[in-house]
């Protein structure tokens, strides 16, 4: 049995301003138990885009039904894209911990580029 992998199949996605961007992410295993988070950018200055565990992210919806037991799809859709949303997005798996969850593995990243709104 192989260790969990985080798969972001697209290296890049291009979306027109005002549209929604779908960023795909899948896990290869149900364990370790722990939440998924999406970030824009890497390192200490990365921006949290979506936290499965907590928080309010009005522009973000999950593509699949996360409450299904065997769900391994953690793709998200971000609505009303603007040029400020451009960047590289990382799907990150955390594993449950005590007292805090521990970052476990990150996807390779998907670069989002934003095209000008068609006139």
């Amino acid at each position: 049995e192989d260790e969990l992998q985080v798969i972001q199949p697209e290296k890049s996605v291009s979306v027109a301003a005002g549209e929604s961007a779908t960023l795909r992410c899948a896990m290869t295993s149900l364990i370790p138990v722990g939440p998924i988070m999406w970030f824009r950018g890497a390192g200490a200055g990365r921006e949290l885009i979506y936290n499965q565990k907590e928080g309010h992210f009005p522009r973000v919806t999950t593509v699949s039904e996360l409450t299904k037991r065997n769900n391994l799809d953690f793709s998200i859709s971000i609505s009303n894209i603007t040029p400020a949303d451009a960047g590289t997005y990382y799907c990150v798996k955390f594993r449950k911990g005590s007292p805090d969850d521990v970052e476990f593995k990150s996807g390779a990243g998907t670069e989002l580029s934003v095209r000008a709104k068609p006139s």
Partner: antibody, heavy 128, light 107 residues
Framework: AVTLDESGGGLQTPGRALSLVCRGS????????MGWVRQAPGKGLEFIAS????????HYAPAVKGRATITRDVGQSTVRLQLNNLRAEDTGTYFC?????????????????????WGHGTEVIVSS | ALTQPSSVSANPGETVKITCSGD??????YGWYQQKSPGSAPVTVI????KRPSGIPSRFSGSASGSTATLIITGVQVEDEAVYFC??????????FGAGTTLTVLG
């Protein structure tokens, strides 16, 4: 303090149904995965069934799949194991178990890999 | 499957190590459960690989590396005599247990 108290065991007739209840106190069962582990006489611990903190995710051991149903009642702070069509090999002590991880989201599923509390157990004897 | 020795023995005051080996590296957490007599309630002495619940003496510690977990009892005492089960999970089993290790404290 966290406590788990099981009830419902006793002498049972083969082919009949059994309902075991685990009552938890000192914590909210809506935030933790819960489950049942049994021990046959002279044997080790055997996972039987678990239910996720979301109340909908469940898993059953092959030995009881199709015969067992695990449910919970948050208001009563109870977890129930219904086991139908009892067999002699269902004989043993049934323990309620609680996972340590407080989970408020879906991907916890129904895992019990960090058990921090056990009940005292309830003995089940299946015999004609 | 989790594999552990069927028995270990030690004199009071000695250090005891009990190992638990998984059949793959995807057992992310291990726990150790003490049972003093058959059918009695197990007591968790270690969970999250190395966390000790409140009320468990500090002589109990745990570690995990790769697919192997170890329970360490430093300065074993007579009252530690029991069967110790390791537990974990894999992607298709929410909980799995080893067959148990009987610890005998001599003297």
């Amino acid at each position: 303090a966290v406590t788990l108290d099981e009830s419902g065991g006793g002498l049972q007739t083969p082919g009949r149904a059994l309902s075991l209840v685990c009552r938890g106190s000192g914590f909210s069962i809506s935030s933790y995965n819960m489950g049942w582990v049994r021990q046959a006489p002279g044997k080790g611990l055997e996972f039987i069934a678990s239910i996720g903190s979301d109340g909908s995710s469940t898993h059953y051991a092959p030995a009881v799949k199709g015969r067992a149903t695990i449910t919970r009642d948050v208001g009563q702070s109870t977890v129930r194991l219904q086991l139908n069509n009892l067999r002699a090999e269902d004989t043993g002590t049934y323990f309620c178990a609680k996972d340590a991880y407080q989970c408020s989201y879906a991907t916890c599923n129904d895992y019990l890999d960090t058990i921090d509390a056990w009940g005292h157990g309830t003995e089940v004897i299946v015999s004609s | 499957a989790l594999t552990q020795p069927s028995s270990v023995s030690a004199n009071p005051g000695e250090t005891v190590k009990i190992t638990c080996s998984g059949d793959n590296s995807a057992h992310y957490y291990y726990g150790w459960y003490q049972q003093k007599s058959p059918g009695s309630a197990p007591v968790t002495v270690i969970y999250y690989n190395d966390k000790r619940p409140s009320g468990i003496p500090s002589r109990f510690s745990g570690s995990a590396s790769g697919s192997t977990a170890t329970l360490i009892i430093t300065g074993v005492q007579v009252e530690d005599e029991a069967v110790y089960f390791c537990g974990s999970a894999d992607s298709s089993n929410p909980a799995i247990f080893g067959a148990g290790t009987t610890l005998t404290v001599l003297g």
